[in-house]
C-alpha cells in the first residue's frame, strides 16, 4: 500500500502527541480497543482498531489521518490478521503504543 511521506507521518505523530500530552484522564471515556500487530500494515491495523470507537472527538482527526494512509476502505466491525483479538487495551495506551512505534519508524526513515 501507499507509504505515508515524511510530512504526513510527522503530522500524525504531532496529532498523537497533542491528544496524549500530560493526559491522565481516560481517552474516549476509557473505551477499549483491540491491540494490533505493529510489525506490518500498522496504519490499516490502527485504523481497523480505532474505527470501532465512535463519538470520541479526541481521536476523530487521528482516524481521518489513518484512513488517508490505508489503501483500502476500513469499516467498523472489520477484522483482519493485523488485529490481536485476544487482547484489548484502553484507547490512551493504544495511542501511546502507536506513537512510540511511529517515532521508531520515523527515526529509521521508513516513512
Amino acid at each position: 500500500g501507499p507509504v505515508p511521506p515524511y510530512t504526513a507521518l510527522k503530522e500524525l505523530i504531532e496529532e498523537l502527541v497533542n491528544i496524549t500530552q500530560n493526559q491522565k484522564a481516560p481517552l474516549c471515556n476509557g473505551s477499549m480497543v483491540w491491540s494490533i500487530n505493529m510489525t506490518a500494515g500498522v496504519y490499516c491495523a490502527a485504523l481497523e482498531s480505532l474505527i470501532n470507537v465512535s463519538g470520541c472527538s479526541a481521536i476523530e482527526k487521528t482516524q481521518r489521518m489513518l484512513s488517508g494512509f490505508c489503501p483500502h476502505k476500513v469499516s467498523a466491525g472489520q477484522f483482519s490478521s493485523l488485529l490481536v483479538r485476544d487482547t484489548k487495551i484502553e484507547v490512551a495506551q493504544f495511542v501511546k503504543d502507536l506513537l512510540r512505534h511511529l517515532r521508531k519508524l520515523f527515526h529509521q526513515g521508513t516513512f
Epitope: 510527522k10 500530552q21 500530560n22 517515532r103 527515526h107
Partner: antibody, heavy 126, light 109 residues
C-alpha cells in the same frame, strides 16, 4: 555524564535583548522536549516556555508574561537550546534554568529523567 | 491564567509525616510533578506523573492525586528534607506549564 550548561546571562538595560544558550551532553538531545524556567530573587519557580523535539513537531509554547518577547529555539546538530529575550523588563530579572521537560519525557523515552542546568543570572536594570 | 495553589509553609518534627498539597482545576485530567529545591541549588524532580518516583529518590517520598488535589507525602521526614517544594503541571490543553507558588518545608531539629 548527563548535563546541561547555561550561558549568556548578564546585565542589560530595560528594552534591551539577550540570548541565552544551554549546551546539552550525555543524552540524545534531539529526542528531548526542553523547557526554560526562571526564578526571580527570593521568589518561586516560573515556567517560561518549552520546545518539543523536532520529531514531535518542534512546537513552542510560552507563558503569558513572555509571549511575543521571548523565542525558544534549538539546534540539534549542536545539542544546544536557546532563549532569545527581547524588550526586556525589570521584572525579567531572574536566574534562568534550562531543563528537560517532564511532560515530554514519555515521547523522548526519558521517563522520569530529570536534568537541569546550574542556571544563569539575567539582571535587567537601568 | 491557570494557577496551582500550595500552602506557603509546612513544619514537622523529624520522623513525622509531612504532607504538601497542590490544588488546580485541571489536575483531575493532568499529571502533577513535584520538585525539591534546596537553597542555592537547581530543583530536583522527586515525583513525576502524580505518584512515580525517579531512580535515586528515597522511598519516603510518595505522591498521590485525587480530584483537583495532588499531594506530596514525606514519610518519616528527615532534616535533610528541609527545602522548598514545588508542584508543576499543565493547563487543560497540556501546552502551557505552571508551577505552584512553592511550600517551604521546615523539619524542626
Amino acid at each position: 555524564e548527563v548535563q546541561l550548561v547555561e550561558s549568556g546571562g548578564g546585565l542589560v538595560k530595560p528594552g534591551g535583548s539577550l540570548r541565552l544558550s544551554c549546551a546539552a551532553s550525555g543524552f540524545t538531545f534531539s529526542n528531548a522536549w526542553m523547557s526554560w524556567v526562571r526564578q526571580a530573587p527570593g521568589k518561586g519557580l516560573e515556567w517560561v516556555g518549552r520546545i518539543r523535539s523536532e520529531i514531535d513537531g518542534g512546537t513552542t509554547n510560552y507563558a503569558a508574561p513572555v509571549k511575543g518577547r521571548f523565542t525558544i529555539s534549538r539546534d540539534d546538530s549542536k545539542n544546544t537550546l536557546y532563549l532569545q529575550m527581547n524588550s526586556l523588563k525589570t521584572e525579567d530579572t531572574a536566574v534562568y534554568y534550562c531543563a528537560t521537560d517532564q511532560v515530554g519525557a514519555y515521547y523522548g523515552d526519558y521517563y522520569g529523567m530529570d536534568v537541569w542546568g546550574q542556571g544563569t543570572t539575567v539582571t535587567v536594570s537601568s | 491564567s491557570y494557577e496551582l495553589t500550595q500552602p506557603p509553609s509546612v513544619s514537622v518534627s523529624p520522623g513525622q509525616t509531612a504532607r504538601i498539597t497542590c490544588s488546580g482545576d485541571a489536575l483531575p485530567e493532568k499529571y502533577a510533578y513535584w520538585y525539591q529545591q534546596k537553597s542555592g541549588q537547581a530543583p530536583v524532580l522527586v515525583i513525576y506523573e502524580d505518584s512515580k518516583r525517579p531512580s535515586g529518590i528515597p522511598e519516603r517520598f510518595s505522591g498521590s492525586s485525587s480530584g483537583t488535589m495532588a499531594t506530596l507525602t514525606i514519610s518519616g521526614a528527615q532534616v535533610e528534607d528541609e527545602a522548598d517544594y514545588y508542584c508543576h503541571s499543565t493547563d487543560s490543553s497540556g501546552n502551557h506549564g505552571v508551577f505552584g507558588g512553592g511550600t517551604k518545608l521546615t523539619v524542626l531539629g
